[in-house]
Amino acid sequence: DTHKSEVAHRFKDLGEEHFKGLVLVAFSQYLQQCPFEEHVKLVNEVTEFAKTCVADESAENCDKSLHTLFGDKLCTVATLRETYGEMADCCAKQEPERNECFLQHKDDNPNLPPLVRPEVDVMCTAFHDNEATFLKKYLYEVARRHPYFYAPELLFFAARYKAAFAECCQAADKAACLLPKLDELRDEGKASSAKQRLKCASLQKFGDRAFKAWAVARLSQKFPKAEFAEVSKLVTDLTKVHTECCHGDLLECADDRADLAKYMCENQDSISSKLKECCDKPLLEKSHCLAEVENDEMPADLPSLAADYVESKDVCKNYAEAKDVFLGMFLYEYARRHPDYSVMLLLRLAKAYEATLEKCCAAADPHECYAKVFDEFQPLVEEPQNLVKQNCELFEQLGEYKFQNALLVRYTKKVPQVSTPTLVEVSRNLGKVGAKCCKLPEAKRMPCAEDYLSVVLNRLCVLHEKTPVSEKVTKCCTESLVNRRPCFSALELDEAYVPKAFNAETFTFHADMCTLSEKEKQVKKQTALVELVKHKPKATKEQLKGVMDNFAAFVEKCCKADDKEACFAEEGPKFVAASQAALA
């Protein structure tokens, strides 16, 4: 389906508002340090050019690819070399190498200040004064901090952001109305960003076969009444959408996502009974709703898998003739029967089945060799079941903060070379699995927990790839996508690690501690805990608990004192000395 002008095609398909939003997101994700005004200028220039192409597709440069047009535009930025260093070298390359170069320079942890939320009245004034600029600023700030954010979904977040201000800036108590909505958007946005980052990592590091396998498993759980052929079609289309978005082709991605939503809504009867309410919604909401739709009910009386996948005389013929399709069918059949399993577990089972066939179909008696293949699945199933059970028990016993601390200690002992801020961020997020998943019924716990942990551990992998410090982390991150979580779970105390020298400065605190929010206080304490474990990796739980309890008492005491700073100055060294003695 070729068009004389790709930019005109996408402008017409998407409409001006979405076109401009997506171009702004694309530019902000590539040039993460550029000021807002610079990006707005570039977007306006691209939009004006697109309009000339809509008017006349044969006009000069309208036949150029989007990568060429956007790359040329990005390369006009005057301060490219000063701001981005070697990224400026991308501009000397031709497409498609230039775009690949830009993609490689996306920074998952950009050195940007945390977003500070102004007073509600200040925000409402800004919203009323210039709504368009206010919303563009939101897209820009989120996109530059999350360079792999799923662009069409970010437009949906922006629409919700706009709706929140439109409603709450009229309310009697603006803050009571607005702040919970903004908190929800922030938390959902961070989760959405992390989930998409795993999809992109899956595609970029492990290839589209890995992504397709993930999608077959997940869509088969969601749509157990759909035939394999239907699921395969959805998987192919979904893979194209995410490949485009992860590759920076945001206009094509958004356009194809809209087409996929249209297709699903036109074919509900052969997909799922749960799509109805999604399909009545406007585009952005509809696509979001379809992505989040609950699992349909499983068909009654699904037959045993053994007949076709173990007992049949044709198992090896199927495997030899159409390996990926046959394994895809197996994965589809297993997943639609097991909404209670995590996608990662389902993928491990498919991998185990594949390995068995690879071995047995070359054996003298293949059937005899693979006859017990389903029995081999049992330990693979029990491992995450036991892990979820044990960790939920620990979470219920400790509560979220102390559960996070247990994970901080556990992971610092496993990989002490990892930077303290990364260990704190990742362990805090791992700890959130408790509140998110442990309250769910048994049948939903494992898919919730393990698939969430995969997303969090991907963040560790992405940050570690930028600054590699641990061979163990590299190994767990690169060897197998589906075995990442079991790989990290299996890591023990790193015996080769040389403990970090004690630095009193790390454990010196000031009165500013008292004015921090509860979350910020927790982060400070957890940072100290990681440093403590790095200093004494063999410290027992009891020793660490004693030090942390003393720390909490010391902070509480000084924050109640009349002269807080003097208290910290006097009590701090005593706390450090007592801690060193306790850990000796």
């Epitope: 394999f228 052929a229 007949a307 076709d308 049949s312 005389k313 044709d314 199927n318 003739e321 069918m329």
Partner: nanobody, 123 residues
Framework: EVQLVESGGGLVKPGGSLRLSCAAS????????AAWFRQAPGKEREFVSA???????TYADSVKGRFTISRDNAKNSLYLQMNSLRAEDTAVYYC?????????????????WGQGTLVTVSS
């Protein structure tokens, strides 16, 4: 176990049309390869047409352009639309199924068979 039952056979004039149906029971067969074979009096059973899970069809040269195979997975059924019938199409038509990703063309590859339905083309 899969049970197959054909229907739709009968007497038809040359140039006429018939639609054969095959209903499967016992388990869903949407991912199975399904096929039609035929056996004329005193002859070997021969391949007519097959369809795979993707609804990709293959045909014997003798029926290409005249016969169309299709399936309705919701009804767990297979069909054969036969147009421009000739006297040499007279035979007992059998429906067959097997769990294969690639639809085979040889009868020995199929595990499940119907009892057949007679098609007679005569003026």
């Amino acid at each position: 176990e899969v049970q197959l039952v054909e229907s739709g056979g009968g007497l038809v004039k040359p140039g006429g049309s018939l639609r054969l149906s095959c209903a499967a029971s016992g388990r869903p067969v949407s991912n199975y390869a399904a096929a039609w074979f035929r056996q004329a009096p005193g002859k070997e059973r021969e391949f007519v047409s097959a369809i795979n899970w993707q609804k990709t069809a293959t045909y014997a040269d003798s029926v290409k352009g005249r016969f169309t195979i299709s399936r309705d997975n919701a009804k767990n059924s297979l069909y054969l639309q036969m147009n421009s019938l000739r006297a040499e199409d007279t035979a007992v038509y059998y429906c067959a199924a097997v769990f294969r990703v690639v639809a085979p063309k040889t009868q020995y590859d199929y595990d499940y068979w119907g009892q057949g339905t007679l098609v007679t083309v005569s003026s």
